[in-house]
């Protein structure tokens, strides 16, 4: 049973390592993948010193984690590398970190990227 | 630390019901999916059951749908797998399994026993 | 129905290096099916040994490693010990909510 499925057909594309992995650095990345597998978009992003550092933005292979996500929400307690997915076109272009600890109210800190 | 534990287990009739129960701890079950794996005595793991981190998308292997029905209470930590019309090839050890990303099974329940005979 | 094979048995003598292979009857194995493998002993949970193909999961020793041999994923485990007697098993994920289990393989390690 799947209830209120959103497709996934392109994310906003972002690599901070452009010139290195020779790709664009920035625009949008249609999903390709096998007609029985659902699409999702991600983010990942580092936290220097309050700063945020973009690494990459993009789409993601079937993954069952991201699934109902329509949102791009991090939710893990001061993870390395921030991460989120998400399933709806272009649903990457916002991301946030709201850590859900066991027992202490969550805080919400948005981020709308400007790569 | 993260903690599944497994219960409802049991001895059943065939065509009987169980429901199984797996109590999360150690992480923020609502942002996990979570899945139901089996072990028959002296066979090898059969994937059974997958279920969305909202609940909204399960999923069930062919021999089990229409039969069993996985379901979670996120206010509760708590994940079910509701099992009717139990079969004699239904007696296993049931193994609750949190899912990470990529799709694998990152922790283990210690497993609840299901025997299905009359 | 996807039928996802893994060797019956294998031996490994101490300090060897054994690869156990895990392929499918729909055709090659790739990265995009994120093989993971289990350790299991028995009348114990299994273990995570390595997901996405070849990331090793946390405590997980550097002698198994996983990675894409040919059309199937593999587990090698370099410099085998006593207590690596155990079942092994892959996992794919099929996308939309199926995963399948290989059959496992019962490694002994002689001596």
């Known amino acids: 049973a799947i209830l209120g499925r959103s497709e996934t057909q392109e994310c906003l594309f972002f690599n901070a390592n452009w010139e290195k992995d020779r790709t664009n650095q920035t625009g949008v990345e249609p999903c390709y993948g096998d007609k029985d597998k659902r699409r999702h978009c991600f983010a990942t992003w580092k936290n220097i010193s309050g700063s945020i550092e973009i690494v990459k933005q993009g789409c993601w292979l079937d993954d069952i984690n991201c699934y109902d996500r329509t949102d791009c929400v991090e939710k893990k307690d001061s993870p390395e590398v921030y991460f989120c997915c998400c399933e709806g076109n272009m649903c990457n272009e916002k991301f946030s970190y709201f850590p859900e600890m066991e027992v202490t109210q969550p805080t919400s800190n948005p981020v709308t990227p400007k790569p | 630390e993260v903690q599944l534990l497994e219960s409802g287990g049991g001895l059943v009739q065939p065509g009987g019901s169980l429901r199984l129960s797996c109590a999360a701890s150690g992480f923020t079950f609502r942002n996990s999916a979570m899945s139901w794996v089996r072990q028959a005595p002296g066979k090898g793991l059969e994937w059974v059951s997958g279920?969305?981190?909202?609940?909204?998308?399960?999923f069930y292997t062919d021999s089990v749908k229409g039969r069993f029905t996985v379901s979670r209470d996120n206010s509760r930590n708590t994940l079910y797998l509701q099992m009717n019309s139990l079969r004699a090839e239904d007696t296993a050890v049931y193994y609750c399994a949190k899912v990470y990303y990529y799709s694998f099974f990152d922790y283990w329940g210690q497993g609840t026993l299901v025997t299905v005979s009359s | 129905q996807t039928v996802v094979t893994q060797e019956p048995s294998f031996s490994v003598s101490p300090g060897g290096t054994v690869t156990l292979t895990c392929g499918f009857n729909s055709g090659s194995v790739s990265t995009s099916y994120w093989p993971s493998w289990y350790q299991q002993t028995p009348g114990q949970a299994p273990r995570t040994l390595i997901y996405n193909t070849n990331t090793r999961s946390s405590g997980v020793p550097d002698r198994f490693s996983g990675s894409i041999l040919g059309n199937k994923a593999a587990l090698t485990i370099t410099g085998a010990q006593a207590d690596d007697e155990s079942d092994y098993y892959c996992?794919?994920?099929?996308?939309?909510?199926?995963?399948?289990f290989g059959g496992g393989t019962k490694l002994t390690v002689l001596g």
């Open positions: 279920i969305s981190v909202t609940g909204g998308s399960t």
């Open positions: 996992v794919l994920w099929m996308g939309s909510g199926i995963w399948v």
